[in-house]
């Protein structure tokens, strides 16, 4: 339950008042307003939307709303020299060309400035050669190709299906395999759910639909030209050759109609097993090259996109705290979209807008939160989380001293089945308690709590009667706050049924068909799921900003640390002989985890019993809670990933979207049997165990009694 606050002018200004003020109809109206034209990062349209949001947030009652701008590297197709892929015959004549853009959605035929499908930050180039089909282009797919099938991708153009992992990882893997170009396509097996019509008659991807997206491997750096520092007027910028994370080979995305034309001619090796076959009527041969009759034909890419330093704009709104104005709770989500952004990001931006309006309504009635709430509309998320990262770099000193929590607010929905939450363990109890107080929007759960429907539909794999909460990975704007700065973070949205819908993301992700109508007709006609997400996100912000004692439970961190230690130990124990040979022990890590568990337990007892009317004691205990996440930060960062500094969690090195626990140890152990110098490799494992041990122990000590 929300605590009664000294800052409340009347008792009615509580969590219930805030939640009751949130209206589905407003979210619907805001979504419609935000999705009528494209809002691509770096464009005039997105600047105008930033100014509109600034103006409306001021009207809603925030204390101040500012635009902050940065000049960052963005990437666009050449307007007069379009990107495409062709099949060429032995004379070099183009006998097939892929589509230059997607067929426009119904009602949007006359909209201008729809950016054609492209892979942002692809270098220019016109490679030609034989095609190799590489499945999802995951690490394990290339292992299968190179090690088991003895297929060499060097000098070849690879074609990979979207899904399973972040597209930037696919490109990195292809580069390492020696490919000269990458074609990404959406296979119906991953982006066409059986029994559902394609857009505009359902939420499936039509054959001409294409997923846009960046293909960077930034590892948290932000703007590729100014890693570590804000891209402001006086920033030193690297040359493009030294820029962080840029791909070195041309990359281009296509839809499944065009993919059919490329894949139907494939020859060479057969696919290794059914997991390599999608749903197109093609053999899914791996190649290299085309089959007999077409063996003299090649594939040629024509990529002419340009990267240019471009101004972007964040909107930062402030609602000053009455008691602890120097403690910040941040709610942020991006505003830039690939095209209309019907789901990504505007279903999230519309929810943020309504949350701001509700907080503003309470403020106009005389209420203030205990702590300061910052609201952010980030720019250029689609180009590598640039707006959020640059702002956090500019404000890092303030954030590391004052940042209580960051709640992310990208897409509110990726389905309409149940809730999905990823967050720090510190927020588990906050999320459980909040969802127990909210009503479920799900059919068949009328009058039941959100916690109940969520638990039923997405049960925890470890604890019966509890819902699943996942680890934070990356691919969204919480990255810099959590992975770099160590600010407790969380995200929530409505999701699909992962049991029955095996496809990756939602089918129309990053396509021109992500429209208002997609949401209003097929995902959430009553906007009840949007409202629920607004209640969850807004409720979390309310509690984090308003409860006297921060709603963090350090005991939940103790539980997961033990689980993660067990997991990494079990991975290592797949090599018992080497562990013995190189004297690899996890005893110190388990000891540190045990210490953490005991200290966290004692801290929780003190937290329960201390005099909450003593402002000094209260502030001291809250600071210990706030700084616990910070204590997991290693200032040196992870190996070769200096901006991923959290020792307990990092984005997977093989899939940016996924979170990995004890990432330093995990990466040191990964594929260790193939390392040329086992002694050095196991030495690195030992080093990473010692770093993890130290970090867990040091974090535990921040919870010890101060004196």
């Amino acid at each position: 339950k929300s605590s009664s606050e000294a800052t409340n002018i009347t008792p009615k200004h509580n969590m219930k008042a805030f939640l009751d003020e949130l209206k589905a109809e407003n979210i619907k109206k805001f979504l419609h307003n935000f999705t009528q034209i494209p809002h691509l990062a770096g464009t005039e349209q997105n600047f105008q939307l930033a100014k509109q949001i600034q103006s409306q947030w001021k009207e809603f009652g925030l204390d101040s709303v500012e635009l902050t701008h940065y000049d960052v590297l963005l990437s666009y197709p050449n307007k007069t020299h379009p990107n495409y892929i062709s099949i060429i015959n032995e004379d070099g004549n183009e006998i097939f060309n892929t589509s230059l853009f997607e067929p426009p959605p119904a009602g949007y035929e006359n909209v201008s400035d729809i950016v054609p499908p492209f892979s942002a930050f692809s270098p220019q180039g016109m490679p030609e050669g034989d095609l190799v089909y590489v499945n999802y282009a995951r690490t394990e797919d290339f292992f299968k190709l190179e090690r088991d099938m003895k297929i060499n991708c060097s000098g070849k153009i690879v074609i990979a299906r979207y899904g399973k992992v972040f597209r930037g990882n696919k490109v990195k893997n292809a580069q390492l395999a020696g490919a000269t170009g990458v074609i990404l396509y959406s296979d119906p097996a991953d982006y066409f759910a059986p029994g559902v019509k394609s857009y505009p008659d359902g939420w499936n991807l039509p054959g001409g639909g294409v997923q846009r997206g960046n293909i960077l491997n930034l590892n948290g750096a932000g703007d590729p030209l100014t890693p570590g520092y804000p891209a402001n007027e006086y920033a030193y910028r690297r040359g493009i050759a030294e820029a962080v994370g840029l791909p070195s080979i041309p990359v281009h995305p296509i839809g499944y109609y065009d993919a059919q034309k490329l894949l139907e001619k494939m020859g060479g090796s057969a696919s290794p097993d059914s997991s390599w076959r999608g749903s197109l009527k093609v053999p899914y041969n791996v190649g290299p090259g085309f089959t007999g009759n077409f063996s003299t034909q090649k594939v040629k890419m024509h990529i002419h996109s340009t990267s240019e330093v471009t101004r972007i704009y964040n909107v930062i709104g402030t609602l000053r705290g009455a008691v602890e104005p120097d403690r910040y709770v941040i709610l942020g989500g991006h505003r830039d979209s690939w095209v209309f952004g019907g789901i990504d990001p505007q279903s999230g931006a519309a929810v943020v807008h309504e949350i701001v309006r509700s907080f503003g309504t309470l403020k106009k009635e005389g209420w203030r939160p205990r702590r300061t709430i910052l609201f952010a509309s980030w720019d250029a998320e689609e180009f590598g989380l640039l707006g959020s990262t640059e702002w956090a770099e500019e404000n890092s000193r303030l954030l590391q001293e004052r940042g209580v929590a960051y709640i992310n607010a990208d897409s509110s929905i990726e389905g309409n089945y149940t809730l999905r939450v990823d967050c720090t363990p510190l927020m588990y109890s906050l999320v459980y308690n909040l969802t127990k107080e909210l009503e479920s929007p799900d059919e068949g759960f009328e009058g039941k709590s959100l916690y109940e429907s969520w638990t039923k539909k997405s049960p925890s794999p470890e604890f019966s009667g509890m819902p699943r909460i996942s680890k934070l990975g990356s691919g969204n704007d919480f990255e810099v706050f959590f992975q770099r700065l160590g600010i407790a973070s969380g995200r929530a949205r409505y999701t699909k049924n992962w049991e029955t819908n095996k496809f990756s993301s939602y089918p129309l992700y990053h396509s021109v068909y992500e429209t208002y109508e997609l949401v209003e007709k097929f995902y959430d006609p009553m906007f009840k799921y949007h409202l629920t997400v607004a209640q969850v996100r807004g409720g979390m912000v309310f509690e984090l900003a308003n409860s006297v004692v921060l709603p963090f439970d350090c005991r939940d961190y103790a539980v997961v640390l033990r689980k993660y230690a067990d997991k990494i130990y079990n991975i290592s124990m797949k090599h018992p002989q080497e562990m013995k040979t190189y004297s690899v022990s996890f005893d110190s890590l388990f000891s540190a985890v045990k210490n953490f568990t005991e200290i966290a337990s004692k801290f929780s007892e003190r937290l329960r019993d201390f005099d909450k009317s003593n402002p000094i004691l209260l502030r001291m205990m809250n600071d210990q809670l706030m700084f616990l996440e910070r204590a997991f930060i290693d200032p040196l960062g992870l190996p070769d990933r200096p901006f991923y500094r959290h020792v307990i969690y990092a984005p997977s090195s093989h899939n940016k979207y996924a979170g990995e626990s004890f990432p330093g140890i995990y990466d040191a152990l990964f594929d260790i049997e193939s390392k040329v110098d086992p002694s050095q490799a196991w030495g690195e494992v030992k080093r990473q165990i010692s770093i993890a041990t130290f970090t867990v122990q040091a974090a535990a000590e921040t919870l010890s009694e101060v004196a």
Partner: antibody, heavy 119, light 107 residues
Framework: EVKLVESEGGLVQPGSSKKLSCTAS????????MAWVRQVPEKGLEWVAS????????YYLDSLKSRFIISRDNAKNNLYLQMNSLKSEDTATYYC????????????WGQGTLVTVSA | DIQMTQSPASLSASVGEAVTITCRAS??????LAWYQQKQGKSPQLLVY???TLADGVPSRFSGSGSGTQFSLKINSLRPEDFGSYYC?????????FGGGTKLEIK
């Protein structure tokens, strides 16, 4: 065998209304988008309107949007075109046609029915 | 709206000859193009879709080609039953417009 049979056209007064119908057989009607295409005598073809599988979405030639209404009854395998405030320039043979999606060609055609708008 | 321009408007040819009809789109329609044949007093019949794929039952003397804005329909070795009118049509966006037609007559 696929069959699309339009109802009788005929002579109608300017300003009056006329409802055309088309009955389908030989295929799963609800699996197809349906459309009306017209042809002025001795002239080319002009798309008039389309309707999606279940009738929840309709699309019209802009110039006809305010006067014509396309609808369907999947239970009866029927397609309809309600034409209001008819003008002499609406005189044409009206064909009912079927396609298997929004972005698709007209795979099936009816035999057509002539509507003459004249005083 | 995308306009479709067909040429020639009319064409005389003899049985056994080969003819080509062209169609130009005012905007890029990739391969979202169909060709229809219409005989006097009859309804149109689908010949080609996706610019180059022959519809079921269409003889192989018909072939479609092109992509983007320029398309053509070729008839090799004309037969008596091939005479009539031919129309191209795009289905890239709404409205799906037709070309003005080409009337193919016996010389």
């Amino acid at each position: 065998e696929v069959k699309l049979v339009e109802s009788e056209g005929g002579l109608v007064q300017p300003g009056s209304s006329k409802k055309l119908s088309c009955t389908a057989s030989g295929f799963t009607f609800s699996d197809y988008y349906m459309a009306w295409v017209r042809q002025v005598p001795e002239k080319g073809l002009e798309w008039v309107a389309s309707i999606n599988y279940d009738g929840s979405s309709t699309y019209y030639l802009d110039s006809l949007k305010s006067r014509f209404i396309i609808s369907r009854d999947n239970a009866k395998n029927n397609l309809y075109l309600q034409m209001n405030s008819l003008k002499s320039e609406d005189t044409a043979t009206y064909y009912c046609a079927g396609s298997d999606g929004y972005w698709a060609w007209f795979a099936y055609w009816g035999q057509g029915t002539l509507v003459t708008v004249s005083a | 709206d995308i306009q479709m321009t067909q040429s020639p408007a009319s064409l005389s040819a003899s049985v056994g000859e080969a003819v080509t009809i062209t169609c130009r789109a005012s905007g890029n329609i990739h391969n979202y193009l169909a060709w229809y044949q219409q005989k006097q007093g009859k309804s149109p019949q689908l010949l080609v879709y996706n610019a180059e794929t022959l519809a079921d039952g269409v003889p192989s003397r018909f072939s479609g080609s092109g992509s983007g804005t320029q398309f053509s329909l070729k008839i090799n070795s004309l037969r008596p039953e091939d005479f009539g009118s031919y129309y191209c049509q795009h289905f890239w966006s709404t409205p799906p417009t037709f070309g003005g037609g080409t009337k193919l007559e016996i010389k």
